[in-house]
């Protein structure tokens, strides 16, 4: 059995040249003719040189999985899905995303260091001593309140709560 060159495919004991991306094999090569190729029908594609008798079906971006169509399918490129705003891609296969997760909400005591994108989750960071955050989408931790000379500090601030002052 012969081993075919790269971008050739085996038919019986003959090696045939592959079709270009965007095409599929209509008729395999013979003594006098090379591989006859046909364009991929609508909603199908081949992304690489290939020996396929049929083009591959275009992917569908499922909104129930948090996906939206970012780039329509073409005869030589599969559909590119992206996550809807507020979500990031959990399972990325090349340029294709199959499932999305909601961006993490930073807990109290942390601030948003890096906002989430379509392909990255939110990055949270702890508040430094002397500051606090209620969490959520807050990008800056707020400084604790300094009780005035006429106020008494009832409870010291934490990374998630402000200082409590009394007016007595």
């Amino acid at each position: 059995q012969p081993s075919c060159r790269q971008e050739e495919f085996l038919v019986g004991d003959e090696c045939c040249p592959m079709c270009n991306p965007g095409y599929h094999v209509k008729q395999v090569c013979s003594e006098h003719t090379g591989t006859v190729c046909a364009p991929c029908p609508p909603q199908t594609y081949t992304a690489h040189a290939n020996g396929l008798s049929k083009c591959l079906p275009c992917g569908v971006c499922d909104p129930d999985m948090g996906l939206l169509t970012w780039q329509e399918c073409s005869s030589w490129k599969d559909t590119v899905c992206r996550c809807i705003p507020g979500y990031f891609c959990e399972n990325q296969d090349g340029s294709h995303c199959s499932t999305c997760l909601q961006h993490t909400t930073c807990p109290p005591g942390q601030r948003v260091e890096k906002r989430g994108t379509h392909d990255q989750d939110t990055v949270c960071a702890d508040c430094l001593t002397g500051t606090f955050s209620l969490g959520g989408t807050q990008e800056e931790c707020l400084p604790w309140t300094n009780c005035s000379a006429f106020q008494q500090e009832v409870r010291r601030g934490t990374n998630s709560t402000d200082t409590t002052c009394s007016s007595q």
């Epitope: 040249p17 006098h32 090379g34 006859v36 040189a49």
Partner: antibody, heavy 118, light 108 residues
Framework: EVQLLESGGGLVQPGGSLRLSCAAS????????MNWVRQAPGKGLEWVSA????????YSADSVKGRFTISRDNSKNTLYLQMNSLRAEDTAVYYC???????????WGQGTLVTVSS | EIVLTQSPGTLSLSPGERATLSCRAS??????LAWYQQKPGQAPRLLIY???TLQSGIPDRFSGSGSGTDFTLTISRLEPEDFAVYYC??????????FGQGTKVEIK
């Protein structure tokens, strides 16, 4: 003797249309795929379009897709190329050529000149 | 899309000399390569198909070789009528049918 004779070329304005014909003789016309190949002045050869023997399968180069249509009338032994929305870059000698399946071209006509200019 | 690159662009030789023309494909086209000769003001003429098969009526001083990506057209002894432009064409995977850019063989 195989003969291919093109006609229909001429001067046309950009955006205009033209229909080329190729009269074939000396072989069983319906048994062969037929092609149009063009050559811009001083340039190389560029395949334009192909049609199967029955006329059921047609292919075109990306550069002419949606503008040029290849067809044939096997009862008249004639190949056609309908050219619409012509551009300056379509200026060339257009040859019709007999194909071995969608392979090489064993016989060529003498060509007809299409000039697209305002 | 497959690209065919012919070299050299121009070959300056004298009658009686041997001419070697090269055609390289960007990916394998098997043995499915043809060579054509074109003289000024004339249509191309098929010389060789299937990389090495001589078209009927073509003198045997013309020969072709190669497969896959590298092909050669050889004219063993140049005759005055052989000075012309030569094109290679792949039909290993078509459409589209692709031609090389041509090699001009001129008198030195």
């Amino acid at each position: 003797e195989v003969q291919l004779l093109e006609s229909g070329g001429g001067l046309v304005q950009p955006g205009g249309s033209l229909r080329l014909s190729c009269a074939a003789s000396g072989f069983t016309f319906s048994s062969y795929s037929m092609n149009w190949v063009r050559q811009a002045p001083g340039k190389g050869l560029e395949w334009v379009s192909a049609i199967s023997g029955s006329g059921g399968g047609t292919y075109s180069a990306d550069s002419v897709k949606g503008r040029f249509t290849i067809s044939r009338d096997n009862s008249k032994n004639t190949l056609y190329l309908q050219m619409n929305s012509l551009r300056a870059e379509d200026t060339a000698v257009y040859y019709c050529a007999r194909g071995k399946a969608y392979g090489y071209f064993d016989y060529w006509g003498q060509g007809t000149l299409v000039t697209v200019s305002s | 899309e497959i690209v065919l690159t012919q070299s050299p662009g121009t070959l300056s030789l004298s009658p009686g000399e041997r001419a070697t023309l090269s055609c390289r494909a960007s990916r394998s086209v098997g043995k499915y390569l043809a060579w054509y000769q074109q003289k000024p003001g004339q249509a191309p003429r098929l010389l060789i198909y299937a990389a090495s098969t001589l078209q009927s009526g073509i003198p045997d001083r013309f020969s072709g070789s190669g497969s896959g990506t590298d092909f050669t057209l050889t004219i063993s002894r140049l005759e005055p009528e052989d000075f012309a432009v030569y094109y290679c064409q792949q039909y290993g995977s078509s459409p589209p049918v692709i031609f090389g850019q041509g090699t001009k063989v001129e008198i030195k």
